[in-house]
């Protein structure tokens, strides 16, 4: 039961995390204009991975995509790549983990297969989370570096080639969303890996030998009795999940909405 809960929780946490990574990647507020020295501007700038926006006090907002690849800073391209890799790995991980969930029966899939799939998805979630955290951190570092540069010829942001000295950018909401989402995906991945250990079947089937103290007339016969191992006559080493009441094979299986055959 604990294994199923851990696996399910890991899946849900990862799902939320990956949704957050996707949201962060799509958000325009990766960097926002720093208003500390200039709170009286009627024009507010903010930038994302894909476009930069200007919001005027009138409420009018204008966004422009970065329609060039070669003209963009290499670091921005790296951040984009990290976030996309994180999303792709996370999405594949989610797909794999759905079929690995203990609460879903797919034909006669062995526990060992589910354990392997759980571990695979867990590793994918961990790498996905790390990619997101790395991407956001690289971008944040780039912002900090640019913030303290006061030379007029530096890049102010991801899309701009022209710098006006008074415009400085600071951390946008997307960075915090990305960090939290990456962390959640990472935690979800770790939980999946932990669940995998509980799912993995014990490989060794211990066959105990019963030794009887016998009289002179009784000859010793090895293997005469099978020792009670707790699994009765079931030679397949199945784990008992619901408090030892029944084995999984003893539970009648009815078709349900979770059956994918």
């Amino acid at each position: 039961m604990a294994v199923t809960a851990c696996q399910g929780l890991g899946f849900v946490v990862s799902l939320i995390g990956i949704a957050g990574i996707i949201a962060a990647t799509c958000m325009d507020q990766w960097s926002t204009q720093d208003l500390y020295n200039n709170p009286v501007t009627a024009v507010f700038n903010y930038q994302g991975l894909w476009r930069s926006c200007v919001r005027e006090s009138s409420g009018f907002t204008e966004c422009r995509g970065y329609f060039t690849l070669l003209g963009l800073p290499a670091m921005l391209q790296a951040v984009r790549a990290l976030m996309i890799v994180g999303i792709v790995l996370g999405a594949i991980g989610l797909l794999v983990s759905i079929f690995a969930l203990k609460c879903i029966r797919i034909g006669s899939m062995e526990d060992s297969a589910k354990a392997n799939m759980t571990l695979t998805s867990g590793i994918m979630f961990i790498v996905s989370g790390l990619c997101a955290i790395a991407g956001v951190s690289v971008f944040a570092n780039m912002l900090v570096t640019n913030f303290w540069m006061s030379t007029a010829n530096m890049y102010t942001g991801m899309g701009g080639m022209v710098q006006t000295v008074q415009t400085r950018y600071t951390f946008g909401a997307a960075l915090f969303v990305g960090w939290v989402a990456g962390g959640l995906t990472l935690i979800g991945g770790v939980m999946m890996c932990i669940a995998c250990r509980g799912l993995a079947p014990e490989e060794t089937n211990y066959k105990a030998v019963s030794y009887h103290a016998s009289g002179h007339s009784v000859a010793y016969k090895p293997g005469g009795f099978k020792a009670s191992t707790g699994f009765g006559s079931n030679t397949k080493n199945k784990k008992i999940y619901d408090g030892g009441a029944r084995t999984e094979d003893e539970v009648q299986s009815y078709p349900s909405k979770h059956d994918y055959v």
Partner: antibody
Framework: QVQLVESGGGVVQPGRSLRLSCAAS????????VYWVRQAPGKGLEWVAV???????NYADSVKGRFTISKDNSKSTLYLQMNSLRAEDTAVYYC????????????WGQGTLVTVSS | DIVMTQSPDSLAVSLGERATINCKSS????????????LAWYQQKPGQPPKLLIY???TRESGVPDRFTGSGSGTDFTLTISSLQAEDVAVYYC?????????FGQGTKVEIK
């Protein structure tokens, strides 16, 4: 068509209060920002205050704390509550609409004269 | 506050001649985010409210004759009347639309020589 009509001007003693109104038609105050701009006799234009479509406001330093800009969206009316009036507040007060993009005043009222004198 | 300084204070030009008014701001009105200059030009004739001529430093308001041209970027801007007409006699103001308060220049009076 867009129209702005100011009212409420007159002669007032220093230290007293006055409320100006600006009736807007041809557009909604929920979609556009509206400004108050004043012009002292024989002088240039001075920006006074603005209320944006969303309700945010900004003021010139010279009137901050004394003047309050507000609007009634349902009545399509803009207000300028002027307290602690001074002689230097004597001017023609215009209300003007913001054009929405690149922040310029595209429509102006005819103005209302406020005279602060003892 | 941003200080807007216009030059000259007054200008006398013959009909059909070019009139040029300059405006200098104490801080750049160019926004790096969209590469737009937040500066407007207004015309005010005696006894009338101001009229918007140019916004965004160079975009002509609809209905404004094409003899009026706005140019410049950053801190230096120019309003040019390519061929002065009798109806162009007025006071012209530039205005900062980027930073609060939205300050105006002191005005330039254009007359016919």
């Amino acid at each position: 068509q867009v129209q702005l009509v100011e009212s409420g001007g007159g002669v007032v003693q220093p230290g007293r209060s006055l409320r100006l109104s600006c009736a807007a038609s041809g557009f909604t105050l929920t979609s556009y920002g509206v400004y108050w701009v004043r012009q002292a006799p024989g002088k240039g234009l001075e920006w006074v205050a603005v209320v944006w479509a969303g309700g945010n406001t900004n003021y010139a330093d010279s009137v901050k704390g004394r003047f309050t800009i507000s609007k009634d969206n349902s009545k399509s009316t803009l207000y300028l509550q002027m307290n602690s009036l001074r002689a230097e507040d004597t001017a023609v007060y215009y209300c003007a609409r913001d054009r929405g993009r690149l922040l310029a005043m595209d429509y102006w009222g005819q103005g209302t004269l406020v005279t602060v004198s003892s | 506050d941003i200080v807007m300084t216009q030059s000259p204070d007054s200008l006398a030009v013959s009909l059909g001649e070019r009139a040029t008014i300059n405006c200098k701001s104490s801080q750049s009105l160019l926004n790096s985010g969209n590469q737009k200059n937040y500066l407007a030009w207004y015309q005010q004739k005696p006894g009338q409210p101001p009229k918007l001529l140019i916004y965004g430093a160079s975009t002509r308001e609809s209905g404004v004759p094409d003899r009026f041209t706005g140019s410049g970027s950053g801190t230096d801007f120019t309003l040019t009347i390519s061929s002065l007409q009798a109806e162009d006699v007025a006071v012209y103001y530039c205005q900062n639309d980027h930073f609060f308060p939205f300050t105006f220049g002191q005005g330039t009076k254009v007359e016919i020589k």
